[in-house]
Interface confidence: medium
């Protein structure tokens, strides 16, 4: 067989759909691949072929359409299936060609069994909410194309198992799902459940999301640093393990890179000679809001590191501060004894 | 809000279940603690239910104690064979300050407490 | 399980004054650690977590401090409504399953004169 420019097995797009719901999946090579689309193509006399390995084989097959009710189709760049059964999954392979070109990439189709509560395997997206924000949407996804403008499905809403019905503040809005003012307590799962008639067929489509409600950028505030702090003195004798932590506050800010650094004499400690570990512990209040402890220690710290300067500094998209540790030796204690020999001694 | 309920004076060798009941927040989404104090004692943890209801607890409480959760706002603590040592203002609290890996590591909002004595 | 151990029992101390307690871990816990407060006939209340960050609403008169498997809580310009019990709190085992867990320590009397 001729040459065919294989882009292999795409499993950056792990597609999964729900079992007995109609599932539409374009060609990835249109929207990841090539550099141009499935129009320009077909008017220049490429075909676009799709066919499919089960699952647990490793035999490429055609695939069939020519089953009842025309289940599996294909329109333009888009492989339709009316609905889905859980015996479709496999890797699925579209193929655009004619006699002088080839290209071709496979994917991954999982059907997924849901139970009554849309509990599944599905991978959920998430969809944060400012806490105390004012009203805010979500919109039910990945709903386009499946229905004409003119066909006007119905909507149901849920959040975990429960329809969404005289909820204080979530309000089902066709499409959308208002929340007045998000709390903690709006933390879950909702689905939509849209149903639409086709041919005289009743189609349903389950959408399910994560809602996360995470702080407001309204109380956002830069890095607040806890640790070094004026109130501790690190007093260590040379020798001795000196142990540091500096420890960050961050406010959730919404793709800020939360960012915590020591320097050592304005260096970064990869740039010094000196013995210096940094171990990093993070967590997180429940709107996201990070907690960051980074722990410098030096194991036997020398008179010379002792004079040195430690500053932590941390950034986030609301600025950049930094605190300076409180470092010195520790005094040794009079040796009285040989103090008061000398004292008492003949003139 | 998280409240405790179901302590009462019970006899030595008595099983008893107490429950908390949280408002304001799921327990689809938080972990919650149990914590007892013996009159005039220190605190003593016994264990924590994950949001997603994996249990954990002290190696002391392993076997005699049973945290449940029967709803998204209520968790059951059940206490089989009851002695004289347990005697205590039993605390449930919402566990919070959240790792990688989902575990609490403080708990920042307390029940008023439940006394359970017992006694023959 | 790590035992954490609390010091001293008890302290007096004069209004404006200032409180050290001292807790100790058996094994490293690096910072996670906690400290509550606890008045008479009242539910503990979060003052410090992960060893040094301040609780929201704590009075910045709280500051915690330390590492590994030792820690320091210090109430500076101490006020008469300081006057409570105070514990210390560590995590244990976290991302280890079934070795997770949390110890108190046996708490400090705290007597504002």
């Known amino acids: 067989s001729e040459r065919c420019d294989d882009w292999g097995l795409d499993t950056m797009r792990q597609i999964q759909v729900f079992e007995d719901e109609p599932a539409r999946i374009k060609c990835p090579l249109f929207e990841h691949f090539l550099k141009f689309n499935y129009s320009t193509a077909h008017s220049a006399g490429l075909t676009l072929i799709w066919y499919w390995t089960r699952q647990d084989r490793d035999l490429e097959e055609p695939i069939n359409f020519r089953l009842p009710e025309n289940r599996i189709s294909k329109e333009k760049d888009v492989l339709w299936f009316r609905p889905t059964l859980l015996n479709d999954t496999g890797n699925y392979t579209c193929m655009l060609r004619n006699t002088t070109y080839c290209s071709k990439v496979a994917f991954p189709l999982e059907v997924v069994q849901k139970d009554s509560c849309f509990n599944s395997p599905m991978k959920l997206p998430v969809h944060k909410l400012y806490i105390e924000y004012g009203i805010q949407r979500i919109t039910c996804p990945n709903v386009d194309g499946y229905f004409p403008s003119s066909v006007k499905p119905t909507i149901t809403w849920y959040m975990g198992c429960y329809k969404i019905q005289n909820f204080n503040n979530v309000i089902p809005e066709g499409m959308n799902l208002s929340f007045l003012i998000a709390l903690i307590s709006n933390n879950g799962n909702y689905t939509c459940v849209v149903t639409y008639p086709e041919n005289g067929r009743t189609f349903h489509l389950t959408r399910t999301l994560t809602v996360k409600v995470v702080g407001s950028p309204k109380n956002a505030v830069p890095p607040v640093i806890h640790s070094p702090n004026d109130h501790v003195v690190y007093e260590k004798e040379p020798g001795e393990e000196l142990l540091i932590p500096c420890t960050v506050y961050f406010s959730f800010l919404m793709d800020s890179r939360n960012e915590v650094w020591w320097t050592i004499d304005g260096k970064k400690p990869d740039d010094i000679t000196i013995d210096v570990t940094i171990n990093e512990s993070i967590s997180h209040s429940r709107t996201e809001d990070e907690t960051r402890t980074q722990i410098l220690s030096i194991k036997k710290v020398t008179s010379e590191d002792l004079k040195r300067s430690y500053v932590c500094h941390a950034r986030s998209a609301k600025g950049e501060v930094a605190k300076a540790a409180k470092v010195k030796q520790k005094v040794p204690a009079p040796r009285y004894t040989v103090e008061l020999a000398c004292g008492f001694g003949a003139t | 809000s998280v409240e405790e309920s179901g302590g009462r004076l019970v006899t030595p060798g008595t099983p008893l279940t107490l429950t908390c009941t949280v408002s304001?927040?799921?327990?689809?989404?938080?972990?919650m603690g149990w914590v007892r104090q013996a009159p005039g004692k220190g605190l003593e943890y016994i264990g924590i239910?994950?949001?997603?209801?994996?249990t954990y607890y002290a190696s002391w409480a392993k076997g005699r104690f049973t945290i449940s959760k029967t709803s998204s706002t209520t968790v059951d603590l059940k206490i089989t064979s009851l002695t004289t040592e347990d005697t205590a203002t039993y605390f449930c609290?919402?566990?919070?300050?959240?790792?990688?890996?989902?575990?609490?590591?403080?708990?920042?909002?307390w029940g008023q407490g439940t006394l359970v004595t017992v006694s023959s | 399980d790590i035992v954490m151990t609390q010091t001293p029992a008890s302290v007096s101390e004069p209004v404006g004054g200032t409180v050290t307690i001292k807790c100790q871990a058996s094994?490293?816990?690096?910072?996670?650690l906690a400290w509550y407060q606890q008045k008479p006939g009242q539910p503990p209340k979060l003052l410090i977590y992960?060893?040094?960050a301040l609780a929201s609403g704590v009075s910045s008169r709280f500051i915690g401090s330390g590492y590994g498997t030792e820690f320091t809580l210090t109430i500076s310009g101490v006020q008469s409504e300081d006057a409570a019990t105070y514990y210390c709190?560590?995590?244990?085992?976290?991302?280890?399953?079934?070795?997770?867990?949390?110890?108190f320590g046996g708490g400090t009397e705290v007597v504002v004169k």
């Open positions: 609290a919402r566990a919070d300050g959240y790792t990688e890996g989902d575990y609490a590591t403080y708990f920042n909002l």
């Open positions: 304001g927040f799921s327990l689809n989404v938080y972990n």
């Open positions: 239910i994950s949001s997603s209801g994996t």
């Open positions: 094994q490293s816990i690096t910072t996670w």
């Open positions: 992960q060893a040094s």
């Open positions: 709190q560590c995590t244990y085992g976290i991302g280890s399953g079934s070795s997770y867990g949390v110890a």
